[in-house]
Interface confidence: low
């Protein structure tokens, strides 16, 4: 097990007194019920807390909510319910917090049955003041901010109207009726699907995809026969019904829907689904469900246009549409993703890729762990990570895996060591190199969070009993100190720290229960006095990411380049600070076949880096449909992986000729449709 408070671990000096002086309790004057917490802005210290209490009466439910505000990271709270006229706020819409540091907040109120429309409370000064606004519609969804302009809001009404506000919710205009789904794109563009005859459900597969770039003044129909659509990175995807049957296919656009190409992905039937697992401006991970109720499918990774796809991982666990998948982007190291596969014997195993889906492998067994009962060979097994699927199955897993972009290399997750995920009580494991190697960090399930860009890790044991102890580590989980933050244990409900992992404050939320009442309580602990000084140059060391063979000149090369980072030494107890920026030095690598994916018509046999022609296409001209034109491909089978920066070295030939012929994959363009009369 990991070193505890023993001879291997030096204690942080006088930490009890330092933390006691920086522990702030707040008891909320509320009956229990539900509580939700939102951070308003970045580095502002402003937190909004909404408590809601329902009293089920005989003929109706009576609700009461209270709103609290902190501007010191949760150390003190002020009841500001009077600013929203003591109105009951609908928790299912949550608190709609504006993007970036806009300081905007929208709360949606509960209104009486016969009212003409809903009601919102709006703030643009970090919740210091609110303005009440009555809506001309009843909202079906939370207000959605345009990512580019926080004054622009959109919402769907219960009558399927698409409503837009250009002045942060002061005035609303219905810009379209019969809308099923609406999303903000880039440049204040709105994409949405509409139905013509019945309803969203009845017209599924016969929806139209529309775009407005001027907030509803003008529209363009950019797709017909639509089942659904999604946005990922710079890609717009639509699943489109095929002409002759009930199957559908993915089409992709990189110009906001003006032109479409059919993705080289399998079509799916009525009971199957597509899912965008992850996307950036370079590429996309797409899950394609298997026929039948298998609970798994195949992951494909795209080229830079989102058109040509390579099979990345078979038997990928994904239960149902909108169901559970363990697919996780490890944000603390470029190119790393973790997910689960369903093996032939129906056991679940964890797989990891370090090169953006090029190759997947099992997680290396932690050196300080034994293989459990699931292992056939007690000396050979892997670490298996618990994520969304385990949580959905009500296993004793309080949290999904955690990584933060500014805590380079750190990944924390619940797991078990064996041949597959175990239903036994898991332990917590940590990787400090982005998932290459793992160490058991804590025995049993815990809640955990990263503070000060990795300078502190905080954990609380997951227990059904009341708790009053928090654990913390200043050396990336090697050694742990325990601190009793209150004499009176509380029923713990959650840890809250400011998103971005730059803060040094942690809030412990829970409730106290006495004979007659239960009340919400929070304890906010500031670790600033534990990390007494600012980190200096001597506190950092150079670390080469993705290093597996230091003797090799190409060691660390992933997607055509390697990166060296300045990492905080484990032995340094100091503050990275709120303005800490990850320091990295990239260097370009020579190209090898690993830097190329297999082109259209080619595939990579197992354990081979060469791409070979698909047997069924051998001797055929490689022609495919692109932007509605027939293209002829002259290739020796390779296309550079999206985002790969390699130069020199291997350079496979590739040429695409426009055959100047129209082709029929382009179901989507309205221009290609002969519109039928209704």
């Amino acid at each position: 097990s990991a070193p505890g408070e023993d001879e291997e671990c030096g204690r942080v000096r006088d930490f009890v007194a330092k933390l006691a002086n920086n522990t702030h309790q707040h008891v909320f004057d509320d009956l229990r019920g539900s509580v939700s917490l939102s951070w308003v802005g970045d580095s502002t210290g402003v937190i909004l807390v909404l408590t809601t209490f329902h009293v089920p009466l005989v003929i109706m439910t009576f609700g009461q909510s209270k709103l609290y505000r902190s501007e010191d990271y949760g150390k003190n709270f002020k009841d500001i319910t009077d600013l929203i006229n003591n109105t009951f706020i609908r928790t299912e819409f949550g608190m709609a917090i504006g993007p970036e540091n806009s300081g905007k907040v929208v709360l949606t109120a509960e209104v009486s049955g016969g009212s003409r429309g809903g009601r919102i409370f709006r703030s643009s000064d970090f919740a210091k003041n609110f303005v009440q606004t009555d809506l001309p519609f009843h909202p079906l969804t939370q207000m959605m901010y345009s990512p580019q302009n926080s004054d622009y809001l959109l919402a769907l009404s219960t009558e399927n109207g698409l409503w837009v506000s250009k002045n942060f919710g002061g005035k609303w205009e219905e810009i379209h009726k019969a809308v099923c789904l609406a999303k903000w794109g880039s440049d204040n563009t709105i994409f949405f699907t509409t139905y013509a005859n019945g309803s969203c459900k009845a017209d599924l597969g016969a929806l139209e995809l529309w775009r407005t770039s001027d907030l509803g003044k003008s529209f363009k129909t950019i797709g017909v026969k639509i089942y659904s659509f999604g946005l990922g990175g710079r890609f717009l995807f639509a699943s489109v019904m095929a002409d002759k049957d009930t199957t559908r296919r993915i089409h992709v656009s990189t110009d906001q829907g003006d032109t479409w190409s059919m993705a080289q992905l399998p079509s799916v039937g009525q009971e199957q689904f597509y899912s965008i697992l992850a996307a950036n401006d370079d590429m996309v991970f797409m899950h394609v469900d298997e026929p039948g109720d298998t609970g798994f499918g195949t992951i494909f990774t795209s080229d830079d246009r989102g058109i040509v796809y390579s099979k990345s991982l078979d038997r990928h666990l994904y239960t149902t549409t909108g169901g559970e998948t363990d697919f996780t982007n490890v944000t603390s190291l470029r190119g790393v993703y973790i997910t689960s596969v369903l093996s032939e014997d129906n056991s679940i195993q964890t797989m990891i890729t370090f090169d953006q889906g090029g190759r997947w492998t099992h997680l290396r067994k932690p050196e300080n762990s034994e293989c459990d009962a699931t292992a056939k060979n007690k000396n050979e097994c892997s670490l298996h990570i618990h994520a969304s699927y385990s949580i959905s199955q009500k296993l004793n897993v309080p949290m999904a895996p955690l990584s933060e972009p500014n805590a380079v290399g750190i990944v924390i997750a619940h797991g078990s060591v064996g041949d597959a995920i175990s239903v036994m009580v898991p332990d917590v494991y940590i990787s400090d190199d982005g998932g290459y190697s793992w160490t058991k960090m804590l025995e049993g399930p815990h809640y955990y969070t990263i503070l000060d860009s990795g300078g502190i890790i905080v954990a609380i044991e997951h227990s059904s009993r009341p708790i009053n102890v928090i654990k913390f580590s200043t050396d990336e989980g090697q050694c742990w100190q325990t601190y009793t933050f209150t004499r009176d244990p509380i029923y713990f409900t959650g840890l809250a720290s400011e998103p971005g992992a730059r803060s040094m404050n942690i809030s412990i939320w829970g409730f106290t229960e006495s004979f007659l009442t239960s009340q919400w309580v929070s304890y906010t602990i500031d670790f600033k006095d534990i990390l007494e000084r600012n980190c200096e140059e001597k506190d950092y060391t150079i670390w080469l990411a993705h290093s597996t063979d230091p003797e090799d000149y190409e060691d660390g090369c992933i997607l055509g380049y390697k990166e060296q980072f300045l990492r905080l030494r484990k032995s340094s107890v100091c503050q990275n600070g709120r303005d800490y920026v990850v320091t990295k030095q990239p260097s370009i690598c020579l190209c090898s076949l690993e830097d190329f994916l297999c082109d259209f018509g080619y595939y990579r046999p197992e354990n081979d880096s060469k791409c070979v022609e698909q047997p069924e296409l051998k001797g055929h001209d490689l022609e495919f449909c692109l932007y509605g034109r027939e293209e002829h491909l002259t290739t020796n089978g390779y296309r550079k992986i999206p985002g790969d920066k390699c130069q020199g070295g291997v350079n496979p030939v590739r040429e695409v000729k426009d055959l100047k012929k129209k082709c029929t994959s382009n179901f989507l363009s309205p221009e290609k449709q002969n519109s039928k009369s209704n």
């Epitope: 810009i175 009726k177 509409t194 013509a196 019945g198 529309w210 003008s218 529209f219 009369s677």
Partner: antibody, heavy 122, light 107 residues
Framework: EVQLVQSGAEVKKPGESLKISCKGS????????IGWVRQMPGKGLEWMGI????????RYSPSFQGQVTISADKSISTAYLQWSSLKASDTAMYYC???????????????WGQGTLVTVSS | EIVLTQSPDFQSVTPKEKVTITCRAS??????LHWYQQKPDQSPKLLIK???QSFSGVPSRFSGSGSGTDFTLTINSLEAEDAAAYYC?????????FGPGTKVDIK
């Protein structure tokens, strides 16, 4: 089959009121905008306004705002155009037309009624 | 409001000839322009929607093109039954407007 059937021709005196109708069939009446178009003798088409029968949302051309009222009764799938006080210059053929999709004001007039001739003369 | 102008106002054409009618918008309307045909004593009929999409049942000799402010309706090989008035209509922004019309007759 989508059909829009308009009420018959009317002869009125200036100052009188009038309400003409347009009955829709063969489609979901409440889900498509219906517009009214005027065509004065020997002249072109003029867009007057539209109504969404689902919630009686109406949009008028500024030229006709306050001059006419567009309404709908979804229970009998009928749209109306009415005047409270006719003028001789209201003499024209009036067409109702249905938009091509159940959407906001966007789209072509895909289906047309046969027209109602209104003559206003003293 | 958006003003649509059509040219020519009138065109007299022999059968099998190609006819081109233009419609110009006072500001950009994307592809939100539609074309109608109206024969004497009949209701208008939709020919082309969204600048270039043929409406079902419309003979293939009718085609549309253009976007932004300049649009064209082309009748590739005129037939006697095509004698009619042709109107353009924008649905880009309220109020919708029609062009003044182009009358085509057969020589």
């Amino acid at each position: 089959e989508v059909q829009l059937v308009q009420s018959g021709a009317e002869v009125k005196k200036p100052g009188e009121s009038l309400k003409i109708s347009c009955k829709g069939s063969g489609y979901i009446f409440t889900s498509f905008w219906i517009g009214w178009v005027r065509q004065m003798p020997g002249k072109g088409l003029e867009w007057m306004g539209i109504i969404y029968p689902g919630d009686s949302d109406t949009r008028y051309s500024p030229s006709f705002q306050g001059q006419v009222t567009i309404s709908a009764d979804k229970s009998i799938s009928t749209a109306y155009l009415q005047w409270s006080s006719l003028k001789a210059s209201d003499t024209a053929m009036y067409y109702c037309a249905r938009h091509s999709r159940g959407s906001f004001w966007y789209g072509a007039f895909q289906h047309w009624g046969q027209g109602t001739l209104v003559t206003v003369s003293s | 409001e958006i003003v649509l102008t059509q040219s020519p106002d009138f065109q007299s054409v022999t059968p099998k000839e190609k006819v081109t009618i233009t419609c110009r918008a006072s500001q950009s309307i994307g592809s939100s322009l539609h074309w109608y045909q109206q024969k004497p004593d009949q209701s208008p009929k939709l020919l082309i929607k969204y600048a270039s999409q043929s409406f079902s049942g419309v003979p293939s000799r009718f085609s549309g093109s253009g976007s932004g402010t300049d649009f064209t309706l082309t009748i590739n090989s005129l037939e006697a039954e095509d004698a009619a008035a042709y109107y353009c209509h924008q649905s880009s922004s309220l109020p919708h407007t029609f062009g003044p019309g182009t009358k085509v007759d057969i020589k």
